[in-house]
């Protein structure tokens, strides 16, 4: 595939990545799938600056990111190491709360209204952010 050198239309460039901010809501798995179909992934927050950038663009709205613990430990969807990486949980979070009455705990992470993170039921229809890195090989075949 060819290398992507600029962001697609309606995506925002920041620090060699492209971001797309939804204005509707989906369950985490559907949001994850949406990003994959765009040759991207749910946003992976790796630094203070990236947190601030995303926080600014989403505003005070619950928004899915690419972090989950559906298989046990917390994992970023692109394989970024969770344990040694940037974290911005709200105090007392994540708590894997079972008291919501929807069955199970809370396995998917989202930005809260103040930008910090919370774990919640993955089926909730929150907005989401897709991210793709510039300079990575795209899946599209090169133009002849």
């Amino acid at each position: 595939g060819s290398e992507r050198t600029c962001c697609p239309v309606n995506w925002v460039e920041h620090e060699r990545s492209c971001y797309w901010f939804s204005r509707s809501g989906k369950a985490w798995a559907d949001a994850d799938n949406y990003c994959r179909l765009e040759d991207a992934h749910l946003v992976v927050v790796t630094s203070w600056e990236e947190q601030k950038f995303v926080q600014h663009h989403i505003g005070p709205v619950n928004t899915w990111m690419g972090l989950h613990d559906q298989n046990g430990p917390w994992k970023w969807v692109d394989g970024t190491d969770y344990e040694t990486g940037f974290k911005n949980w709200r105090p007392e979070q994540p708590d894997d709360w079972y008291g919501h009455g929807l069955g199970g705990g809370e396995d998917c992470a989202h930005f809260t209204d103040d930008g910090r993170w919370n774990d919640d039921v993955c089926q909730r229809p929150y907005r989401w952010v897709c991210e793709t890195e510039l300079d990575k090989a795209s899946q599209e075949p090169p133009l002849l």
Epitope: W48, E49, K52, F53, Q55, H56, F86, K87, N88, W89, P91, E92, D114, G115, R116
Partner: antibody
């Protein structure tokens, strides 16, 4: 009422170490990030370091990296700054300050403690 | 590191004057900009956060504006208690640098 009280300042020789503490009260200490900021005599403010409410993230200024370590004990409501290999240019009033949480502004400050590095 | 440059470094003004202080960042900090006031021998006090939000208890004569790299603190009608030094600070990227300060003196 939020109170932040720094202690541990004093006169120390270059190359030696000093440990500053900040005792917090009047708020849930374990829910807030904390900063150290310093001010050399007659000079402006210089940010030194921040630690997340749970210690999960720490950042410091280039001028103190590798020499100063920020830490906290949420069970004792205390913030510390371990200062090693002190230099004359570290002479300053050191303030601890509370981080508001999301925009990282410093909404409450202590009264400061003076550190003098001199032979 | 992001450099924060304040201007002027000092100014003389009279009670009732409108005062404007400028803070420029060496790169975009979006709107992650705070303003503090400091009086001699005292700890700094938060005035404005996130560019334009007034901290609780701060008089409405203080206001902030700007985005990206250029920011402004305005005191609409200077009062005797406003004579102090003012600092901007960015919180977009660590290290969380301050501006050099602007000393507001009595004319």
């Amino acid at each position: 009422q939020v109170y932040l009280v720094e202690s541990g300042g004093g006169v120390v020789q270059p190359g030696r170490s000093l440990r500053l503490s900040c005792a917090a009260s009047g708020f849930t200490f374990s829910s807030y990030g904390m900063h150290w900021v310093r001010q050399a005599p007659g000079k402006g403010l210089e940010w030194v370091a921040v630690i997340w409410y749970d210690g999960s993230n720490k950042y410091s200024a280039d001028s103190v990296k590798g020499r100063f370590t920020i830490s906290r004990d949420n069970s004792k409501n205390t913030l510390d700054l371990q200062m090693n290999s002190l230099r004359a240019e570290d002479t300053a009033v050191y303030y601890c300050a509370r981080d508001n949480g999301n925009w990282n502004y410093l909404d409450y400050w202590g009264q400061g403690t003076l550190v003098t590095v001199s032979s | 590191d992001i450099q924060m440059t304040q201007s002027p470094s000092s100014l003389s003004a009279s009670v009732g004057d409108r005062v404007t202080i400028i803070c420029r960042a060496s790169q975009s900090i979006i709107s992650y900009l705070n303003w503090y006031q400091q009086k001699p021998g005292k700890a700094p006090k938060l005035l404005i956060y996130a560019t334009s939000s007034l901290q609780s208890g701060v008089p409405s004569r203080f206001s902030g504006s700007g985005s990206g790299t250029d920011f402004t603190l305005t005191i609409s009608s200077l009062q005797p208690e406003d004579f102090a030094t003012y600092y901007c600070q960015q919180t977009y990227s660590p290290p969380l640098t301050f501006g050099g300060g602007t000393k507001v003196e009595i004319k």
